[in-house]
């Protein structure tokens, strides 16, 4: 009968969920030592604390392997929710962006926030502006008082994701023509001037709308 009692008591002790994966366990404090590949985690519930043996550490903790015993250690990285090691975050707190294992409220220069994953990814790299082009109107450099001059810049490196926009790569400004009157020329008829003005405006809008030289978003085309 004594044997039967010991067996049943041992069975209930092993089946107690708090003791799962333990090498030594008590009803009050839970595990104090874990099986080889498991991580020891000290859980706090109000005033009480007890040990658990887990396959992976909970959010906010990372698995620290040691010869005596593997333990769950708290992430000490600022604004980090869960981490891979003591100095590498894998998920930041709400409102912060993950970048190279750290959490930022704004992505560093050259990186752009990817809202769906709250990560900083390589952004769009643009070159220097070209010089302003010739002041012209309706493809003419004379015959008007005012014209438009345009400048452009290259996309040097495309963004990692299509959802990341590049800065403007073409811009125009009003300019004063160097020659108000064309030598021996006539003024452009008003209707033609209007048509050409619309055409040029459309071209500039299209250039500004594109956020990459050869990028996939194609908002202008879809």
């Amino acid at each position: 009968q004594g044997n039967r009692w010991r067996r049943s008591k041992r069975a209930s002790y092993v089946s107690n969920p708090i003791c799962k994966g333990c090498l030594s366990c008590s009803k009050d404090n839970g595990c104090s030592r874990c099986q080889q590949k498991l991580f020891f985690f000290l859980r706090r519930e109000g005033m009480r604390q007890y040990g658990e043996c887990l396959h992976s550490c909970p959010s906010g903790y990372y698995g620290h392997r040691a010869p005596d015993m593997n333990r769950c250690a708290r992430c000490r990285i600022e604004n980090c929710d869960s981490c891979f090691s003591k100095d590498f975050c894998t998920k930041c707190k709400v409102g912060f962006y993950l970048h190279r294992g750290r959490c930022f409220d704004e992505c560093p220069d050259g990186f752009a926030p990817l809202e769906e994953t709250m990560e900083c990814v390589e952004g769009c790299e643009v070159g220097h502006w070209s010089e302003w082009g010739t002041c012209s109107r309706n493809n003419r450099t004379c015959g008007f008082k005012w014209g438009l001059e345009t400048r452009t810049r290259q996309i040097v490196k495309k963004p990692v994701k299509d959802t990341i926009l590049c800065p403007t790569i073409a811009e125009s400004r009003r300019c004063k023509m160097t020659m108000r009157h064309c030598p021996g020329g006539k003024r452009t008829p008003k209707a033609k001037e209007k048509r050409n003005k619309k055409k040029k405006r459309k071209l500039i809008e299209r250039a500004q709308e594109q956020h990459s030289v050869f990028l996939a978003t194609d908002r202008a085309n879809q």
Epitope: H128, S130, E131, R153, Q154, V156, D162, V213, F214, L215
Partner: antibody
């Protein structure tokens, strides 16, 4: 491995439409932009246009009214249509892949010789 | 749109050095350009991308090939010329939704 291969007719009659296919392997058309470039005999390279990884298209303004580039991602193919062919459209036609992040052509097809003649 | 100017032909002796020039239209002197090499009856091959300050080469391009810049000029330098360097060299440039090639320079190795 990454490859591009052009296919289509070698001979087309003037005023007809040229249809060329660029079949790609080793990468996805939804990740890369594909361009068409041609080279008339003894002359330099001329950029014709491109289909973006997002599906949009851009063309050389000198050819704009005559050229159409489309793609079929399920077949990994990019198609070039050039209508109202003239003798000066006789050229070697290449498709080329644009590098993922930088704007240059990192992989080229072997090219296909197209002759416009009656 | 940018224009690229290249001299039609250059010749140099085997083992010597040569410098090919590609000139951007002055408005675009800050632009990156690319150099491509094309052997007879072969497809063009990417050599390098060249900015006004640095260059990055394609895979497997020998150290004999290098790039440099000065103002609107972009240079491709080849040292210790080999017979296999005999080819046409094109420069190319991207702008807003287009790509432009230079007319090409025929390099002859004597």
């Amino acid at each position: 491995q990454v490859q591009l291969k052009e296919s289509g007719p070698g001979l087309v009659q003037p005023s007809q439409t040229l249809s060329l296919t660029c079949t790609v392997s080793g990468f996805s058309l939804t990740s890369y932009n594909i361009h068409w470039v041609r080279q008339p005999p003894g002359k330099g390279l001329e950029w014709m246009g491109a289909v973006w990884r997002g599906g949009g298209t851009y063309y050389n303004s000198n050819l704009k009214s005559r050229v159409i580039i489309t793609r079929d991602t399920s077949k990994s193919q990019v198609l070039l249509k050039l209508n109202n062919l003239q003798h000066e459209d006789t050229a070697m036609y290449y498709c080329a892949r644009e590098e993922l992040r930088y704007v240059y052509f990192d992989v080229w097809g072997q090219g296909i010789q197209v002759t416009v003649s009656s | 749109q940018p224009l690229l100017t290249q001299s039609p032909s250059v010749s140099a002796s085997l083992g010597a050095s040569v410098k090919l020039t590609c000139t951007l239209s002055s408005q675009y002197n800050t632009y990156y350009i690319e150099w491509y090499q094309q052997h007879p009856d072969k497809s063009p091959k990417f050599l390098m991308q060249l900015s006004d300050g640095s260059h990055s080469k394609g895979d497997g391009i020998p150290d004999r090939f290098s790039g440099s810049s000065s103002g609107a000029h972009r240079y491709l330098s080849i040292s210790n010329l080999q017979l296999e360097d005999e080819a046409i060299y094109y420069c190319g440039v991207s702008d807003v939704s287009l790509y432009v090639f230079g007319s090409g320079t025929q390099l002859t190795v004597l």
